[in-house]
């Protein structure tokens, strides 16, 4: 269930301090979009798959991992242009002859239907309607993900209202 974030409108403090600790909240960083229990960042520039992977790491995140068809649909609904494509964290492992997520797990046959070749140097991207494989050297946009984290915000009590 999605956590509800309420606003406190009652102040019973007699002596207001300059700042007050707000309760723990599930927050996405600025510029990141909340989708269920994840925060997503859609890149504005383009890169090969390896550089996209590295960029997400520098942001203390990973390339997008998609758990099921529902999550795929939710993510695709955020892509507003039919032509634009985004790398995700899935590529072809030549040694294991299978699609492998960057967390080490393998693609289940029911998860995603990938259009394109399953071969060396193939990586996976999503568009508004489909999932494709492409040479990893192709330069396109990418999606980073973070798990929603507890953030303790220091805010002025007036900003609670």
């Amino acid at each position: 269930q999605k956590p509800s974030i309420g606003k406190c409108s009652v102040d019973i403090q007699q002596n207001r301090t300059k700042t007050t600790e707000r309760p723990d909240l599930l927050n996405c960083p600025i510029y990141w979009q909340q989708v269920q229990e994840k925060c997503l960042l859609f890149s504005h520039t383009v890169n090969p798959w390896n550089n996209s992977l590295a960029d997400c790491s520098t942001k203390e995140s990973s390339l997008l991992l998609i758990q099921d068809k529902d999550e795929l649909t939710r993510t695709q609904n955020l892509i507003h242009d039919k032509a634009i494509s985004f790398w995700i964290g899935l590529n072809f492992s030549l040694s294991e002859k299978n699609w492998k997520w960057i967390n080490g797990s393998f693609l289940s046959s029911n998860d995603l239907k990938i259009t394109g070749d399953a071969k060396e140097n193939s990586c996976v991207y999503i568009s508004q309607t489909s999932v494709y494989s492409e040479y990893c050297s192709t330069e396109m946009k990418w999606i980073c993900q973070k798990e929603l984290t507890l953030v303790r915000n220091k805010v002025s009590p007036d900003s609670w209202l």
Epitope: V46, K82, A83, I84, S85, F86, M140, K141
Partner: antibody, heavy 122, light 108 residues
Framework: QVQLVESGGGLVKPGGSLRLSCAAS????????MSWIRQAPGKGLEWVSY????????AYADSVKGRFTISRDNSKNTLYLQMNSLRAEDTAVYYC???????????????WGRGTLVTVSS | DIQLTQSPSSVSASVGDRVTITCRAS??????LAWYQQKPGKAPKLLIY???GLQSGVPSRFSGSGSGTDFTLTISSLQPEDFATYYC??????????FGGGTKVEIK
Amino acid sequence: QVQLVESGGGLVKPGGSLRLSCAASGFTFSDYYMSWIRQAPGKGLEWVSYISPSGATIAYADSVKGRFTISRDNSKNTLYLQMNSLRAEDTAVYYCARSLMATGTHLYFDLWGRGTLVTVSS
Amino acid sequence: DIQLTQSPSSVSASVGDRVTITCRASQGISSWLAWYQQKPGKAPKLLIYAASGLQSGVPSRFSGSGSGTDFTLTISSLQPEDFATYYCQQSTSFPPYTFGGGTKVEIK
């Protein structure tokens, strides 16, 4: 203003060389796949070559492979086409074209220059 | 290489007419197809991408459909400025990117 402006065309003898340039302005040049597309007088369109945003990936039509070289200078927002060993059948208007951003190598050409005419004749 | 065959090669029509141009690919290309308009002495202009996506700024009277090998460009109500030559282009991820031979839309 978002635009592409080609230059460098002209009359050249068979076996000769020319270097075409395409100056881009009004957009982030380094984010886009760029191509050269040509059109012989009174004929249809023929894709010639593309180069990826970083310049790391390049492809050519079989008809020009080994004779033409595409390159780019992202610091100067300029695309180039070095044409060697020119033939009469290379006579055409050469267009510089930008692909829609982030479609990978599925190229759709959304911005074109006005073209520059290359005439190969003795 | 993938060949694209356009038909008809030319069509005579009047303002207000509905015009349909077809493009057939020699092998399946999913939805990787674009349509362009070109007027004499001018560069081509992108109308439709990914078979049915309307390019920004293009009037809604232009529409595209199809997938696999058969594609259609429809102009629902022909306007004076629509008299031009139209080209389809396939954009499968492996070059070369081929164009159809063109369809000239002329005034009847």
